[in-house]
Interface confidence: low
Amino acid sequence: FKVATPYSLYVCPEGQNVTLTCRLLGPVDKGHDVTFYKTWYRSSRGEVQTCSERRPIRNLTFQDLHLHHGGHQAANTSHDLAQRHGLESASDHHGNFSITMRNLTLLDSGLYCCLVVEIRHHHSEHRVHGAMELQVQTGKDAPSNCVVYPSSSQDSENITAA
């Protein structure tokens, strides 16, 4: 399977909410002992590999923001912890999963990574990630709402299989 990022760049005004999205593509094993661990974290564009560094989002680690379920099942973080930080991650039946960030500030600007780990017998079996940029703007040049820029299908940094 692979992870696709429908949008590679989100440009938002300060104070707005944004939902960053990834999509799980390809065949998903629905075996009785296969689950998927989906999560989000901040990173930087490393020289070797994007998303190799895992940094917290608003002080919440990738472990705080995880979703854990089988295949294309719906799930969302109900943690008070995440919601207190204006964050919520969710997943639907179609392989889409997202993180919503409320009341954006300039400090939220940066590279965001979604990560899916296929787990069999509690071992990490297969790992894929996607990357996208969030730019939070302020002042007269800022858009009135979030503007999203589609990923090019040739952009290998946005569809990564491990």
């Epitope: 854990h68 017998h121 071992h123 079996e125």
Partner: antibody, heavy 121, light 112 residues
Framework: EVQLVESGGDLVKPGGSLKLSCAAS????????MSWVRQTPDKRLEWVAT????????YYPDSVKGRFTISRDNAKNTLYLQLSSLKSEDTALYYC??????????????WGQGTLVTVSA | DVLMTQTPLSLPVSLGDQASISCRSS???????????LEWYLQKPGQSPKLLIY???NRFSGVPDRFSGSGSGTDFTLKISRVAAEDLAVYYC?????????FGGGTKLEIK
């Protein structure tokens, strides 16, 4: 700081039952696989049970399968081990252990101090 | 079941010397995902086991670099380059690749 505190160990007669608990703190409990490991009086270590992050999948050696049940309550940050049809060879110090994050896939990253189960007539 | 055989049972060493403990599995412990879940633990009297090495050769956080792990397939080794007084303990290998997961019988490191 990661803390695992086991409780529930006791002296029990052969054929009896017991429920062990492991209270976890200092980490996001629902993000980690957990295991029970026991240490026999002759100091041998024996893996007893493992449970996956969400609690859907459990694994046991044949020596305890059907007699022991591992479970977890992620809302209470607690791991359990239900022991039944106990035998004298189940006498041991029972440890709960937290796995690493799933990305590294190792087992006893952190252990509790153990709770003693003695099976004797 | 995978049998883990540790040698020697007891290892007398002088402080500052190198110590080497062997662990042999009865079959390959390479998991189907390509990883080898071979771990080494240390246990001091009255304490719970502590993780030293995971996945054959990776030192766990806080473990001094005098501890190193190596090996592949069925043969694995733990080396302590300069034995310190606090290293005197029982060492166990463990395989987490195949259910049932199994430990070695232990090696006691003691002063010569």
């Amino acid at each position: 700081e990661v803390q695992l505190v086991e409780s529930g160990g006791d002296l029990v007669k052969p054929g009896g039952s017991l429920k062990l608990s492991c209270a976890a703190s200092g980490f996001t409990f629902s993000s980690y696989g957990m295991s029970w490991v026991r240490q026999t009086p002759d100091k041998r270590l024996e893996w007893v049970a493992t449970i996956s992050i969400g609690g859907s999948y459990t694994y046991y050696p044949d020596s305890v399968k059907g007699r022991f049940t591992i479970s977890r309550d992620n809302a209470k940050n607690t791991l359990y081990l239900q022991l039944s049809s106990l035998k004298s060879e189940d006498t041991a110090l029972y440890y709960c252990a937290r796995h690493s994050s799933i990305y590294d896939g190792y087992y006893g990253a952190y252990w509790g101090q153990g709770t003693l189960v003695t099976v004797s007539a | 079941d995978v049998l883990m055989t540790q040698t020697p049972l007891s290892l007398p060493v002088s402080l500052g010397d190198q110590a080497s403990i062997s662990c042999r599995s009865s079959q390959s412990i390479v998991h189907s995902n390509g990883n080898t879940y071979l771990e080494w633990y240390l246990q001091k009297p009255g304490q719970s086991p502590k993780l030293l090495i995971y996945k054959v050769s990776n030192r766990f956080s806080g473990v001094p670099d005098r501890f190193s792990g190596s090996g592949s397939g069925t043969d694995f080794t733990l080396k302590i380059s300069r034995v310190a007084a606090e290293d005197l303990a029982v060492y166990y290998c463990f395989q987490g690749s195949h259910v049932p997961y199994t430990f070695g019988g232990g090696t006691k490191l003691e002063i010569k």
